[in-house]
């Protein structure tokens, strides 16, 4: 998966969408699905959605979790339905974590 090039006609997956960027929809279609957790205004905020552009997902999905944000990505229809991103626990290191699930 490391340096996989985007296909000419990339496969699109249906993803659960829960977040402001989803507008009035409960689902979206993209090259990758994601589930994220961030700390906003001192509150935990979970979001789900999709990356329509391969490069956008590639960058975000390879970002290791930090104390304020974690993203888990997957490929497959509705693959993010039962994924819950988690923030790193204190004292745990995440060497080379990519939080990427291929389904």
């Amino acid at each position: 998966m490391e340096d996989e090039k985007p296909k000419v006609n990339p496969k699109l997956y249906m993803c659960v969408c829960e977040g402001l960027s989803c507008g009035n929809e409960d689902h979206c279609e993209g090259q990758q699905c994601f589930s994220s957790l961030s700390i906003n205004d001192g509150f935990h905020v979970y979001q789900k959605g999709c990356f329509q552009v391969y490069e956008q997902g590639k960058m975000t999905c390879k970002t290791p979790p930090s104390p304020g944000q974690a993203v888990e990505c997957c490929q497959g229809d509705w693959c993010n339905r039962n994924i819950t991103a988690q923030l790193p626990t204190k004292g745990k290191s995440f060497p080379g974590t990519q939080n990427f699930h291929l389904e």
Epitope: E18, G19, L20, G23, N24, E25, D26, D41, F43, V45
Partner: antibody, heavy 120, light 108 residues
Amino acid sequence: QVQLVQSGAEVKKPGSSVKVSCKASGGTFSSYAIHWVRQAPGQGLEWMGRIIPDFGTANYAQKFQGRVTITADESTSTAYMELSSLRSEDTAVYYCARGPTQAIHYFAYWGQGTLVTVSS
Amino acid sequence: DIELTQPPSVSVSPGQTASITCSGDNLRKYSAHWYQQKPGQAPVLVIYYDNKRPSGIPERFSGSNSGNTATLTISGTQAEDEADYYCQVYASVHRMVFGGGTKLTVLG
């Protein structure tokens, strides 16, 4: 400091409309949804609908579809809820509420409430 | 579509543990959020995402969610905890659902 400040109490006649405002401060207006929740005297909380200012379009609870209109004015960071064809059962306190930035699942901040009385 | 059911009232003695339940079909599939409302005031978020506590909410408030039931637990209940409590879930962009509310009475 997040604040939601609502307009004052209203007394309306059956069949008329009411428009309640909710001015938001603290945080970027376009980065959260504004919801409207009502509470009839002695009753529980009832979600009416929401608007994401960035998108401009609103979602409504089925019960209020066709009778409620939620709008937002980004220039003044104000959301509005208009309820038409009022009847006595619409007598309630109407609250606006929002989550923290980007959140859609719960309400972290509430307005003080606006009492709307429908009486002939 | 999910509906949430709460007991209309719960009574507890000061210092004791109060448990307020919220039941709904397959509720564990959703995240439960809890609000406290005192007479004449707007609701206040006390627990969100089943068991997370906003800053400023006392540690005696906790939550859980399993099976068909979410539970708000108040340990060492104090007189100031007397209020109405509502559970809520996000069902879809068109549906935020509240339970009917539970009046918590602190005896004595």
